[in-house]
């Protein structure tokens, strides 16, 4: 097993991305700067800017996107642009989404197979259990915060007037009508896909057909495959397959090395895509603002609901999660967050946890010193099951709808909302048309009207972005916490808990490639700090 890269006082690996996506060395000062530390001399300022260039570009892109969107909206918006020009306007953003989605499948499958194969079953179980516990607790906390805020701020009472303007007949017809049981059965079915290839682009969903049985019209559930990647099924398969590969012992090592190499190549692609991200984000944000009609009117009517959601996300993301991280690691959580600003901005721009996954992996590994076998095992699981933002929004929405329709919420109903929101947000990845359908499930569980889901949909474009940011932040902090847990358990036991599979050279004698051409080779600083020792990179994900 190779030695770990040296870490600075902040516990950060002294490594920086290179052009080919490999890792080069960085001075401790550079790392301090990169992590948001103090930049003193002009030289340090230059290094600081260089280290944070992508982060700064991303932040600028979001701000520029908002400004550009508002500017175009002010000049007439989507109507003035027309469908063709609007399509061209959002194209750079669409391109980023396509690039990221292209990467998801190989990244998730390979990283999870590699990650699961690189951990001994005991460690895998412990790591998985701690991760799921963290995800569950934080989601429950987010739900509680959502309910608490909505009860305190009463967004529904404030927005009651929109009832009149929307019309009495609401739009319950548009609200998905699906049995709660069928939703969870679909979730189970998607965990075990019948066809792995189709799981890459389709998932199972139950719909209903009305049939005439002995003179009575009966609603019969009919299963069908619908468009949309079954990420839950792929995640479960990849983990189980990785464990199976490990069981094979030496026989499976070649295949493990294949998946690890595949993963590294994918990460090289990610490092290239990262530099396009700011451009894409800018146009994604701008495009969404331009597409929206009557943003002002929407804010006037649903302002308190939006405020409630965004405030909840801000409190959970900037106070609750960082506090949990600090309590367990005694490290500065905001330094950690600074390291993942690019994926957070990407999450805001793309509104997709899985699309943000490639960038998040790259950043937590390179900026926050999370080991590959942790990040590449935990992050895909987190992107699938950890949905703090979604749970919080659904709780706010449920209480908002209760207030809007003047329906009471007793203690039992509040607990039901909390539990259902937590459970359904975990399962949302396995349910096609996740967000709205899971909200409908919550409303059904407490007998609240689904008529007003249309109102929630009206501002979903904004709230969902905030949700995604919180979701991916939770995943990243979870990975950071687990890294801390692993560091502590490893320092306590002489025998390392995480057995790692080395990516050895091919069995046939082949010329050793140069570092530039081989992202599997990495240089670490020697003890003296200047001598460079070539070593084989941990091939674990």
């Amino acid at each position: 097993m190779v030695a770990d890269p040296p870490r600075d006082s902040k516990g950060l690996a002294a490594a920086e991305p290179t052009a080919n996506g490999g890792l080069a060395l960085a001075s401790i000062e550079d790392q301090g700067a990169a992590a948001g530390g103090y930049c003193g001399s002009r030289d340090q300022v230059r290094r600081c800017l260089r280290a944070n260039l992508l982060v700064l570009l991303t932040v600028v892109a979001v701000v520029a996107g908002v400004a550009l969107g508002l500017g175009v909206s002010g000049a007439g918006g989507a109507l003035a642009l027309g469908p063709e020009r609007l399509s061209a306007f959002v194209f750079p953003g669409e391109l980023l989404l396509r690039l990221l989605r292209m990467i998801i499948l190989p990244l998730v499958v390979c990283s999870l197979i590699g990650g699961a194969a690189s951990l001994d079953p005991g460690a895998l179980g412990r790591l998985g259990a701690w991760a799921l516990l963290f995800f569950l607790v934080t989601t429950l906390l987010a739900s509680a915060l959502g309910v608490g805020l909505a009860l305190a701020l009463q967004p529904g009472a404030a927005s009651a007037a929109i009832n009149a303007s929307v019309g009495a007949a609401g739009s319950a017809e548009n609200a998905p009508s699906k049995e709660v049981l069928d939703s969870f059965l679909d979730l189970a079915r998607n965990i075990f896909p019948s066809n792995l290839v189709s799981a890459a682009f389709r998932s199972y969903s139950t719909t209903y057909e009305e049939r005439n049985i002995t003179g009575t019209r009966v609603k019969v559930p009919v299963g069908q495959e619908v468009e949309g990647m079954n990420i839950l099924g792929l995640v479960v398969f990849a983990i189980v397959f990785g464990v199976a590969l490990r069981k094979l012992g030496p026989e499976g090592e070649l295949l493990i090395r294949f998946f690890n190499s595949f993963n590294e190549a994918t990460m090289v692609l990610v490092s290239w895509i990262m530099w396009y991200a700011p451009v894409g984000i800018m146009f994604l944000v701008a495009g969404k603002i331009v597409e929206m009609e009557d943003v002002g009117l929407l804010f006037a009517r649903l302002g308190k609901y939006i405020l409630c959601c965004l405030l909840g996300h801000a409190i959970h993301g900037l106070l609750v999660l960082p506090l949990i991280y600090f309590l367990f690691t005694r490290k500065n959580p905001y330094r950690f967050l600074w390291g993942i600003v690019t994926p957070l901005a990407t999450a805001f721009g793309t509104s997709s946890s899985s699309a943000t996954l490639p960038l998040m992996m790259k950043c937590v590994e390179e900026k926050n010193g999370v080991a590959k076998h942790i990040s590449r095992f935990i992050l895909p699981i987190g992107a699938t099951v950890n949905m703090d933002g979604a749970a919080l929004f659904q709780c706010v929405a449920a209480v908002f709808i209760a207030q809007l329709s003047q329906q009471s919420l007793d203690f039992v109903k509040i607990i039901t909302i909390l539990v259902t929101a937590t459970a359904s947000s975990v399962g949302a990845a396995g349910i096609p048309a996740g967000g709205v359908l899971t909200l409908a499930i919550i409303l059904e569980a407490v007998n609240l009207p689904v008529d007003h889901i249309s109102l929630i949909l009206a501002v979903d474009w904004l709230v969902d972005r905030s949700c995604t940011v919180l979701n991916v932040e939770g995943d990243a902090l979870g990975a950071g916490l687990l890294q801390n847990y692993v560091d502590r358990t490893e320092s306590r036991s002489t025998e390392p808990e995480l057995i790692q599979v080395k990516s050895e050279l091919p069995l046939d004698p082949l010329p050793v490639p140069t570092e530039e051409g081989n992202p599997l080779l990495k240089h670490y600083r020697g003890p003296a700090g200047d001598a460079t020792v070539a070593s084989e990179k941990e091939s674990v994900m």
Epitope: A157, N163, A169, K219, S405, Q406, Q407, N447, P449
Partner: antibody, heavy 120, light 107 residues
């Protein structure tokens, strides 16, 4: 006990305005929405809309937008239905009904009804 | 809007009989079906909500059942005071809609 007491019968000429009151007692007025239901003689019941008693916001059914107005006097625990420019087809019995705060849309307590007759 | 149909507009029964009044919705109303009683020139009373839940103060001889689009109200032991018109109402989505009513008479 919970009671909804409506004002007496009304006889109006077309074009006039009528205001029907519904006084609630026995519960916290602002906790439950108040609905209005119309019954034309020999016909079924038709939901007119409801008023959010906490926010004071009226919500009207599609057939009752324009001439109809719901209002409240919270301090007196009273809801009002006003019909402007009454027409012959407004001849009916109007009920106020407390909207339950559970199980979506149903009405657990009803007023005795106010008969409106529109005749020239 | 969801249409509610009570196929039987009037029904004759003897005291002590078991009477069933049916109601059909134009689409699945997921058990959000309520029953009301209106006595001649009297007030309207809620009998049953959410398909089968008895409202407070309603005698236990009244019961409700059904699912999807088909629902029914049953009076197990008809009494003189039960002579009235019975309305069903869906509370699944706005606007709430009522059936045309079933008038119950004594044979």
């Amino acid at each position: 006990q919970i009671q909804l007491v409506q004002s007496g019968p009304e006889l109006k000429k077309p074009g006039e305005t009528v205001k029907i009151s519904c006084k609630a007692s026995g519960y916290t007025f602002t906790t439950f929405g108040m609905s209005w239901v119309k019954q034309v003689p020999g016909k079924g019941l038709k939901w007119m809309g409801w008023i959010h008693t906490y926010a004071g916001v009226p919500i009207y059914g599609d057939d009752f937008k324009g001439r109809f107005a719901f209002s409240l006097e919270t301090s007196a625990s009273t809801a009002y239905l006003q019909i402007n420019n009454v027409k012959n087809e407004d001849t009916a019995t109007y009920f106020c009904a407390r909207r339950s705060d559970n199980y979506r849309y149903f009405f657990d307590y009803w007023g005795q009804g106010t008969t409106l007759t529109v005749s020239s | 809007d969801i249409q509610m149909t009570q196929t039987t507009s009037s029904l004759s029964a003897s005291l002590g009989d078991r009477v069933t009044i049916s109601c059909r919705a134009s689409q699945d109303i997921r058990n959000y079906l309520n029953w009301y009683q209106r006595k001649p020139h009297g007030t309207v009373k809620l009998l049953i909500y959410y398909t089968s839940r008895l409202h407070s103060g309603v005698p236990s001889r009244f019961s409700g059942s059904g699912s999807g689009t088909d629902y029914s109200l049953t009076i197990s032991n008809l009494e003189q005071e039960d002579i009235a018109t019975y309305f069903c109402q869906q509370g699944h989505t706005l606007p709430p809609t009522f059936g045309g009513g079933t008038k119950l008479e004594i044979k």
